[in-house]
């Protein structure tokens, strides 16, 4: 999806970046995650988003659009207040629903243009519309309250372009699936791998007997089990090979010396 | 074996209403596991997505901006099928259509695996 | 919407050859990549998904790879009923969107 013009180019372009680091090539590092991150490019003085893969990479990597701004960016926030102030809803806030094809379970909200409120909804994780928000608070900020907003609705990117799987959007999310916490899994930093892996066997609700096949993450391996025909979750394979490849590419060996946190 | 079959006039005026339907067979319209689209293709434009439909407890509709205020796409469970409309037709709409599958959605992949022959529709007064 | 470009658009090869098309998105889209094979009066076949599975029924002389924006299509040893329109699809954005295709002709 395009990104949508930055207002402030024009005006910030040719000014040099606050701090060295906002110099530095994207990074996405030599682990495997799957992180959306944002990083200013030099080249086009923007702040854009890329893919992180959750380990190593430089100082030039932000969670949000607007920590990139805020941080690379000379002048960005006087500039922002100021295009706030006539700010105007977004055509994308009237788009309704779509939780996307596929089958993730992902809190999400959307502005719902009959209620004329955000509501919370569930996104599947891909190819979904783009009145979707990680959080109220953004919801609220781009499509209800738009006039009151702090940042202008002209800096809604990528980060509010959330239709694919392929991107998270924090260091708690992989495909935009919160990650389950749980003693009886390899810690999250062990695991780089999409995030339902580590979800338990689950044969679901209906009456149906199908063999499929889950990652069990204690031991590494793909199992099978009766999976009822509907309801579940998403660690579930029609293939031991499916499942492996799914799912047993994410465990990395902790190469590190000291305690993760 | 999943089938997709196409049905369609293949000559429509212009300004007038595009219409094919998609029969599936081997699969349901409904179910969860998948969704069912249209994609066209041109000389000019290559494969192009028009727009697909899925079931997840309700129906949902996802469409191309090129054309989304001229599309509609319906299922038909009754039928197990499911229908392309595109008004107001050009003679840039000229194109072969295909109906077809996204499938893999329960193993973290989507693909469209499988498809309909082909319908070429020519706008043309 | 992302640009998907294919290079080469045509490629003259004999039988027995080792072909390479590549695929480059205009923006990350991890592995998020399909492969699809066209024949002349033909839907397109899936080949690969997911930037380097293999679809059911399709022989092990097709492979697939890369990530980020660069992928591969690799044929090992190219057959007569290879010949064909090769197409890539991105299906991490919303469009999903397809390249512009490869034809493998016959030398």
């Known amino acids: 999806l395009s990104e949508e013009a930055d207002d402030t180019d024009s005006e910030l372009g040719s000014m040099k970046p606050l701090h060295t680091f906002c110099a530095m090539k994207a990074d996405d590092g030599p682990c495997k995650a799957m992180i959306r991150s944002y990083f200013f490019n030099m080249y086009t003085h923007q702040c854009e988003e890329f893919i992180y893969g959750g380990c190593e990479g430089n100082e030039n990597r932000f969670d949000t659009l607007e920590e990139c701004k805020k941080t690379c960016i000379p002048g960005y926030e006087k500039t922002a207040v100021k295009a706030a102030s006539g700010a105007e809803r977004p055509d994308f806030c009237f788009l309704e629903e779509d939780p996307g094809l596929c089958r993730g379970y992902m809190k999400r909200y959307l502005y719902n243009n009959q209620t004329k409120q955000c509501e919370r909804f569930v996104y599947g994780g891909c190819l979904g519309n783009r009145n979707n928000f990680e959080t109220l608070d953004e919801c609220k900020k781009i499509c209800e309250n738009p006039v009151h907003s702090p940042s202008p609705v002209n800096e809604v990117q990528m980060s509010d372009y959330v239709t694919d799987g392929n991107t998270v959007t924090d260091r708690s999310t992989v495909n935009n699936i919160v990650v389950p916490q749980s003693p009886k899994v390899p810690r999250r930093r062990d695991y780089r791998g999409r995030p339902w892996c580590l979800q338990p066997a689950d044969s679901g609700l209906c009456k149906a007997s199908e063999r499929r096949f889950y990652y069990n993450s204690a031991t590494g391996k793909c199992h099978r089990f009766n999976y009822t025909g509907c309801g579940g979750n998403n660690n579930n394979f029609t293939t031991r090979r499916r499942c492996l490849r799914s799912c047993k590419t994410g465990l990395i060996k902790n190469k590190s010396k000291g305690v993760v946190k | 074996q999943v089938q997709l079959q196409q049905s369609g006039p293949g000559l429509v005026k212009p300004s007038q209403t595009l219409s094919l339907t998609c029969a599936i067979s081997?699969?349901?319209?409904?179910?969860?596991?998948?969704?069912w689209g249209w994609i066209r293709q041109s000389p000019g434009r290559g494969l192009e997505w028009l727009g697909h439909?899925?079931?997840?407890?309700?129906?949902?509709?996802s469409y191309a901006v090129s054309v989304k205020s001229r599309i509609t796409i319906n299922p038909d469970t009754s039928k197990n099928q499911f229908s392309l409309q595109l008004n107001s037709v050009t003679p840039e709409d000229t194109a072969v259509y295909y109906c077809?599958?996204?499938?893999?959605?329960?193993?973290?992949?989507?693909?469209?695996?499988?498809w309909g022959q082909g319908t070429l529709v020519t706008v043309s007064s | 919407d992302i640009q998907m470009t294919q290079s080469p658009s045509s490629l003259s090869a004999s039988v027995g050859d080792r072909v390479t098309i590549t695929c480059r998105a205009s923006?990350?889209?991890?592995?998020?990549l399909n492969w699809y094979q066209q024949k002349p009066g033909k839907a397109p076949k899936l080949l690969i998904y997911?930037?380097?599975s293999l679809q059911s029924g399709v022989p092990s002389r097709f492979s697939g790879s890369g990530s980020g924006t660069d992928f591969t299509l690799t044929i090992s040893s190219l057959q007569p009923e290879d010949f064909a329109v090769y197409y890539c699809?991105?299906?991490?954005?919303?469009?999903?969107?397809f390249g512009q295709g490869t034809k493998v002709e016959i030398k």
């Open positions: 077809a599958r996204w499938g893999g959605i329960h193993d973290g992949d989507i693909y469209f695996d499988y």
């Open positions: 081997g699969d349901s319209v409904s179910s969860n596991g998948a969704a």
């Open positions: 439909i899925y079931y997840r407890s309700k129906w949902y509709n």
């Open positions: 923006q990350n889209i991890s592995n998020y």
């Open positions: 997911g930037t380097s």
């Open positions: 699809q991105q299906y991490g954005n919303n469009p999903t969107t």
